[in-house]
């Protein structure tokens, strides 16, 4: 069964800036990635970015930069202030649609003891089953 991993990091330089990294562990070809916050996409979450391998990338505030890191992983930088600013316990979710396997989703938030700049390194990324 394919799996999705999610990693959330607060940037040391700006306390209101977050980096979300997500990856897909499966054999299918990815046809769409949807990043949301506040819960899963379609279940109370709000879409931050949609990445299509060929059609391109769409993003909505407070998303600042969404990009493909590899063919099977993406990153998203968020920055905001006031009402649109993420907080330390915000949940971020990534959904990967792959063909022919289908859609797979996982969610993550900032680790509880996360000091800016002291969050876990990119590898090994935490793997979260899509359940």
């Amino acid at each position: 069964t394919p799996e999705v991993w999610v990693q959330v990091r607060m940037e040391a330089t700006e306390l209101s800036s977050f980096t979300i990294r997500c990856g897909f562990l499966g054999s299918g070809s990815i046809s769409l990635v949807t990043v949301s916050w506040g819960g899963p996409n379609g279940a109370g979450g709000t879409t931050l970015a949609v990445l299509h391998p060929e059609r391109g990338i769409r993003q909505w505030a407070p998303a600042r930069q969404a990009r493909w890191e590899t063919q099977s992983s993406i990153s998203l930088i968020l920055e905001g202030s006031g009402a649109s600013s993420p907080c330390a316990n915000t949940t971020f979710c990534c959904k990967f649609a792959s063909f022919p396997e289908g859609s797979w989703e996982a969610c993550g938030s900032l680790p509880p003891s996360s000091d800016p700049g002291l969050s876990a390194p990119p590898t090994p990324a935490p793997i979260l089953r899509a359940d």
Epitope: P40, A97, F99, D131
Partner: antibody, heavy 120, light 107 residues
Framework: EVQLQQSGPVLVKPGASVKMSCKAS????????MHWVKQSHGKSLEWIGI????????SYNQKFKGKATLTVDKSSSTAYMELNSLTSDDSAVYYC?????????????WGQGTSVSVSS | DIQMTQTTSSLSASLGDRVTISCRAS??????LNWYLQKPDGTVKLLIY???RLHSGVPSRFSGSGSGTDYSLTINNLEQEDIATYFC?????????FGGGTKLEIR
């Protein structure tokens, strides 16, 4: 409103082929995968396969490899399934169903079905 | 392939009843379980996806639950329009597979 309109019932002879259609409206065909499902008379549902209308990629249930061929015509927003070398075992209702792209990997909208009867 | 089993092939209930239909997978499907109804005219509609999420437009009297291999669909306050055959489907692996169906009739 999302709708999948399938072609009408067909009666064919054993050994022949049949090609049925599924016209999508209310959304962009290339944005969602399309499944095809078989229901023999009074029985359960069997998954035949799936097509990605964006690039024509397909994946089939091993049981239907060589029996079914899935294609799309993007210009008319229509998906097709062709069944070949028909026998009485192929007599059934065939449904097209849109993949929702939800987690769960469900099929959120279904066509009304195309009835295929194979008889000499 | 993952086998989906609906042990009850038919059941009778009265209008206003609470009805539960069960479905078992031959292996853990991690909540990738969906429920459909098929009306007597052949129309098929999605009710519940990912074990418990209600599809848009589906009345709230329908609910789903379960985990691992065992799942159930509950209909509260049964209405006449709920008379149909109910199928479960797993979305965890290919090929997608369906349960044999549970036909719901009015007592």
């Amino acid at each position: 409103e999302v709708q999948l309109q399938q072609s009408g019932p067909v009666l064919v002879k054993p050994g022949a082929s049949v090609k049925m259609s599924c016209k999508a409206s209310g959304y962009r065909l290339t944005d969602y995968y399309m499944h095809w499902v078989k229901q023999s008379h009074g029985k359960s549902l069997e998954w035949i396969g799936i097509i990605n209308p964006y690039n024509g990629g397909t994946s089939y249930n091993q049981k239907f490899k060589g029996k079914a061929t899935l294609t799309v015509d993007k210009s008319s927003s229509t998906a097709y399934m062709e069944l070949n070398s028909l026998t009485s075992d192929d007599s059934a209702v065939y449904y097209c169903a849109r993949d929702s792209s939800n987690v769960g990997n469900d099929m959120d909208y279904w066509g009304q079905g195309t009835s295929v009867s194979v008889s000499s | 392939d993952i086998q989906m089993t609906q042990t009850t092939s038919s059941l009778s209930a009265s209008l206003g009843d609470r009805v539960t239909i069960s479905c078992r997978a031959s292996q853990d499907i991690s909540n990738y379980l969906n429920w459909y109804l098929q009306k007597p005219d052949g129309t098929v509609k999605l009710l519940i996806y990912y074990s418990s999420r209600l599809h848009s437009g589906v009345p709230s009297r329908f609910s789903g639950s379960g985990s691992g291999t065992d799942y159930s669909l509950t209909i509260n306050n049964l209405e006449q329009e709920d008379i149909a055959t109910y199928f479960c489907q797993q979305g965890n692996t290919l090929p997608r597979t369906f349960g044999g169906g549970t036909k719901l009739e009015i007592r």
